[in-house]
Amino acid sequence: FERTRSLQDPCSNCPAGTFCDNNRNQICSPCPPNSFSSAGGQRTCDICRQCKGVFRTRKECSSTSNAECDCTPGFHCLGAGCSMCEQDCKQGQELTKKGCKDCCFGTFNDQKRGICRPWTNCSLDGKSVLVNGTKERDVVCGPSPADLSPGASSVTPPAPAREPGHSPQ
């Protein structure tokens, strides 16, 4: 099938990093500078994404793959493909319309981005608070009060803090 297809369409032989050049009898020409083709059989190469201003280059463009951007220090990516950059806050804070604000009592944020989230309610799992929460850290839940009664054979190890949530990027 591949052989048949290539007889019908000479462009199918052009690998990634090249394009099928109609101006040169459909021979495979390398992608020009600052462009790429990530699949074979392309009739044009795509222009590379350019990371400038508040964006910086995380991965350089090559003839077969696009550039990737992230944000200048103090900012983090938001939106599809890092289409914008949002200011970082400190751990224990969240970004509001008025700037970075400390998490309210009973909430925490262990990242430089995203919102403050409520501490875990240990009692919902029948456990007790082993380590109190802070603005930067969730509470650590320990064994239930019943497990601590005299004669209990073992102590359940503390549950790990919840995996930090990640805002969509």
Partner: antibody
Framework: QITLKESGPTLVKPTQTLTLTCTFS??????????VNWIRQPPGEALEWLAL???????YYSPSLKSRLTITKDTSKNQVVLTMTNMDPVDTATYYC????????????????WGQGTLVTVSS | DIQMTQSPSSLSASVGDRVTITCRAS??????LNWYQQKPGKAPKLLIY???SLQSGVPSRFSGSGSGTDFTLTISSLQPEDFATYYC?????????FGQGTKVEIK
């Protein structure tokens, strides 16, 4: 509040050099991520981007006009200057400067806000 | 350069109408697409950035959608002050390029 204002001659003769100044307030061109763009619009036509200078002196030019354009900044005066050589009647347009970068807590490659624009006519 | 094509080039509509303007890029530009409004004798004003984010102070009747090559600006209920020319612009690569504009006129 960010404001920008363009200034320069309203009439230029063919072959002469145009010098335009963008004077701005409300931001500093020494702040990371910030840039100033020049964009023009011939009467009744669409917008055309010309040039850009960033806080770190990185400059970008329209490929079709690169040989004729120079963009510079004076951070202490809050000014950006665009020079365009060998002016032609087809360069008659309203010339705008526009801020790019971080407003509030968000940044990206968009133009906001723009100056009011200055109409430059090229005629002998 | 990346070409941006807007359609229609002009349209007539009445106050209260729902208006849709489309913009097509000559290659994928992800979400690096901005929309501007320009009134006669005035500078353009940013409406939408990053394809769908509403600029501060812009009425919520304006919305943007799309990614890749096809994008849309929608005005849910046209108001008298919305009669203007609208431009899309890609910020994916240099040079940034604009569409040719869509003029929204009173029917």
């Amino acid at each position: 509040q960010i404001t920008l204002k363009e200034s320069g001659p309203t009439l230029v003769k063919p072959t002469q050099t145009l010098t335009l100044t963008c004077t701005f307030s409300g931001f500093s061109l020494s702040t990371t991520g910030v840039g100033v763009n020049w964009i023009r619009q011939p009467p009744g036509e669409a917008l055309e981007w010309l040039a850009l200078i960033y806080w770190n002196d990185d400059t970008y030019y329209s490929p079709s006009l690169k040989s004729r354009l120079t963009i510079t900044k004076d951070t202490s005066k809050n000014q950006v200057v665009l020079t365009m050589t060998n002016m032609d009647p087809v360069d008659t347009a309203t010339y705008y400067c526009a801020h790019e970068g971080i407003i509030g807590f968000l940044g990206g490659n968009w133009f906001d806000p723009w100056g009011q624009g200055t109409l430059v006519t090229v005629s002998s | 350069d990346i070409q941006m094509t807007q359609s229609p080039s002009s349209l007539s509509a009445s106050v209260g109408d729902r208006v849709t303007i489309t913009c097509r890029a000559s290659q994928s530009i992800s979400s690096y697409l901005n929309w501007y409004q320009q009134k006669p004798g005035k500078a353009p004003k940013l409406l939408i950035y990053a394809a769908s984010s509403l600029q501060s102070g812009v009425p919520s009747r304006f919305s943007g959608s799309g990614s890749g090559t096809d994008f849309t600006l929608t005005i849910s209920s046209l108001q008298p002050e919305d009669f203007a020319t609208y431009y899309c612009q890609q910020s994916y690569s240099t040079p940034p390029t604009f569409g040719q504009g869509t003029k929204v006129e009173i029917k």
